[in-house]
Amino acid sequence: EPPTACREKQYLINSQCCSLCQPGQKLVSDCTEFTETECLPCSESEFLDTWNRETRCHQHKYCDPNLGLQVQQKGTSETDTICTCEEGLHCTSESCESCVPHRSCLPGFGVKQIATGVSDTICEPCPVGFFSNVSSAFEKCRPWTSCETKDLVVQQAGTNKTDVVCGPQDRQRA
């Protein structure tokens, strides 16, 4: 009785269960009652990452430097090449097909998380007591200067974009 379903890592063809090709290999010829499935390794620039019956291997991804991409991990016969972005850039999508410059945090905002090759800068508003007066992809919000520790007094209050201005204490007259 010919099978209607096959075991894991097998496929049904012409009422027969044939072994799938292992990752890194493509199908050349289906099995017969007498012969095992014929598989061939993918060439150097190709890969297949699953047990398969593909007759063609997939081309490795090309990390195009014109799009700001560079190789993070070279592909093998079983894995695709992983691209990342050059310094100062990050991927526009999970598949990392192109790159854009990291965004800078505007004055009044500081860097919560520095950008990587795959994620953009994360900014946060400077809370009370902190400020940022620059547009930067690296700078965190800085604390206002503590006038008291310098034996000074606050002459001008700080904001989320400016530091406090300290000045000397007024001397009491005798």
Partner: antibody, heavy 117, light 109 residues
Framework: QVQLVESGGGVVQPGRSLRLSCAAS????????MHWVRQAPGKGLEWVAV????????YYADSVKGRFTISRDNSKNTLYLQMNSLRAEDTAVYYC??????????WGQGTMVTVSS | EIVLTQSPGTLSLSPGERATLSCRAS???????LAWYQQKPGQAPRLLIY???SRATGIPDRFSGSGSGTDFTLTISRLEPEDFAVYYC??????????FGGGTKVEIK
Amino acid sequence: QVQLVESGGGVVQPGRSLRLSCAASGFTFSSYGMHWVRQAPGKGLEWVAVISYEGSNKYYADSVKGRFTISRDNSKNTLYLQMNSLRAEDTAVYYCARDTSRGHDIWGQGTMVTVSS
Amino acid sequence: EIVLTQSPGTLSLSPGERATLSCRASQSVSSSYLAWYQQKPGQAPRLLIYGASSRATGIPDRFSGSGSGTDFTLTISRLEPEDFAVYYCQQYADYPPFTFGGGTKVEIK
């Protein structure tokens, strides 16, 4: 390169025996089924026998059933055809050929068997 | 047993002409398992076409196969001097036996 080379042919008297060999090289012999096909002088191709890659499945043409035995030794990359009770009509060139789902893709050069008194 | 009948027995043509060879089966054959072979004098057969219409590795594109069910055709679009030979069809769908047709000889006119 992928190659099949037959040997063991010759002239033999009717009723006698002969063993043909087919030496394989250039491919994983133990993964392929193998066939014997023959061709009488001036005639067409006639399929004789097949054996599966591990030797468990064997089929024969009615004309040789009970007289011929196909076997293989995967450790020696060699296919055999034991021919007993030979008849004049067994006179032919005997070819071994590799089995695939695409047909017989590799053939040997053949070995001549002549059954004559 | 599936009987394959090839016609014509002999085809006399000149180089450059088109050759059409027929193979008829006594019952329906899965086209996945119909092959054509070429054999020259003193040589072993060579696989030309498998699965009724797919060319084997290294076979020039002047050779083509077609057909389904019980009627199959091998066409050589423009005969080259090296194409004059005997051609056999074979079915390997229904076995035993694996059957060959009687052959068609393509000879120079």
